[in-house]
Amino acid sequence: MVPPPENVRMNSVNFKNILQWESPAFAKGNLTFTAQYLSYRIFQDKCMNTTLTECDFSSLSKYGDHTLRVRAEFADEHSDWVNITFCPVDDTIIGPPGMQVEVLADSLHMRFLAPKIENEYETWTMKNVYNSWTYNVQYWKNGTDEKFQITPQYDFEVLRNLEPWTTYCVQVRGFLPDRNKAGEWSEPVCEQTTHDETVPS
C-alpha cells in the first residue's frame, strides 16, 4: 500500500498558486506524484509522475472555487487522493506593496506600488483585482515602540511636520476593507528628516 502525500497545502501569494506537500516515508523506493484539478466535472492532470513535492496551479481562474488533488505513486501502485479546495480571490495572500520614500525637509513623501499579479506578462496588479483596495501605512520614530497608522486615500502620502534630524521608519501593506483582509507588511524603510524649513519672522 502506497501512503498518501502529507501536509498538503496551497501556498498562494499574489495569485501564484503552488500546491505543496511532503513525501511520506516509503521503504520500497522513491515515490512520484500526480496532481490534478477539477475542470467542469473532469479531473485534469497538471503535474504527472513528478518527483517534485509541489505543482504550479497559477493558471486557474482567480475567481473559481477549485478542487485540487494529489497522490503518491510507486510502480503500478498508488495512494488515495488527497483533496483540497481553494478559491484564489479569497485565499491568496496579498504580498507586500512596493514603496518609494523621499525626504523633503521635515516631511516624508511616499509613493506606493500595488503588488503585481504573479506570472502574467502585463502590469496587472492586485489593486486591479480588488475594487476596495487601499493601503495601510504605519510609521514610527526609529528606536521607539509607539507606532502610528494612517490610511492614505491615494497611491501617495506625505507625513508632514516631523521632528527635524530624526530617523523615521515607514512600512505599508494592502488592505481590503470589504473583506477585512490585510496583506503582508513591506520591509521598513527608514529615513532621516533634515531641517524645519519654516523661516523665523
Epitope: 484539478y37 477539477l38 475542470s39 467542469y40 485534469q44 497559477s58 493558471s59 486557474l60 481562474s61 482567480k62 475567481y63 473559481g64 477549485h66 499579479i117 506570472n119 502574467e120 506578462y121 502585463e122 496587472w124 486591479n128 483585482v129
Partner: nanobody
Framework: QVQLQESGGGSVQAGGSLRLSCAAS????????MGWFRQAPGKEREGVAA???????RYADSVKGRFTISKDNAKKILYLQMNSLKVEDTAMYYC????????????????????WGQGTQVTVSS
C-alpha cells in the same frame, strides 16, 4: 462583476457558416483573456478557441482552419466566425472570460476562466 451574453447561434446546413458574438460588461475589457467553449449533449464542455489580452489565439485541433476567434476591444465584443460547419459541431456554445489576464498561461481549460455566459445553441444538419 463581469457579465457575458452570447448571440448568433441557430440552425444551418453542413458546410454553412455562422458568426457568434459575446457582449461583455464590467472590468477593463482589454484585460480579458477570453474563450469559446462548447458542450454537445452527453459530452463534457470543451475548449474551442481562446484569445489573450495581447491578441494571441489558440484553437482546438478539430476547428483549426475553419473557425476564427477575434475581439473588438472598443465595442467589448468577442466573435467566433465558424465556416465549413460539420454535423459534429452541433453543441451549446459558451463564451468565457478571465479578467486581468495576459498570455502567460495559454488558457484553454474550463477551470482557467472565471466568468461564463448562458450559451447559444448551434445546430448543424446534414
Amino acid at each position: 462583476q463581469v457579465q457575458l451574453q452570447e448571440s448568433g447561434g441557430g440552425s444551418v446546413q453542413a458546410g454553412g457558416s455562422l458568426r457568434l458574438s459575446c457582449a461583455a460588461s464590467g472590468y477593463t475589457y482589454s484585460s480579458y483573456c477570453m474563450g469559446w467553449f462548447r458542450q454537445a449533449p452527453g459530452k463534457e464542455r470543451e475548449g474551442v478557441a481562446a484569445i489573450d489580452s495581447d491578441g494571441s489565439t489558440r484553437y482546438a485541433d478539430s476547428v483549426k482552419g475553419r473557425f476564427t476567434i477575434s475581439k473588438d476591444n472598443a465595442k467589448k465584443i468577442l466573435y467566433l466566425q465558424m465556416n465549413s460547419l460539420k454535423v459534429e459541431d452541433t453543441a451549446m456554445y459558451y463564451c468565457a472570460a478571465e479578467p486581468y489576464c495576459s498570455g502567460g498561461y495559454k488558457r484553454t481549460m474550463v477551470a482557467e476562466f472565471g466568468f461564463w455566459g448562458q450559451g447559444t445553441q448551434v445546430t448543424v444538419s446534414s
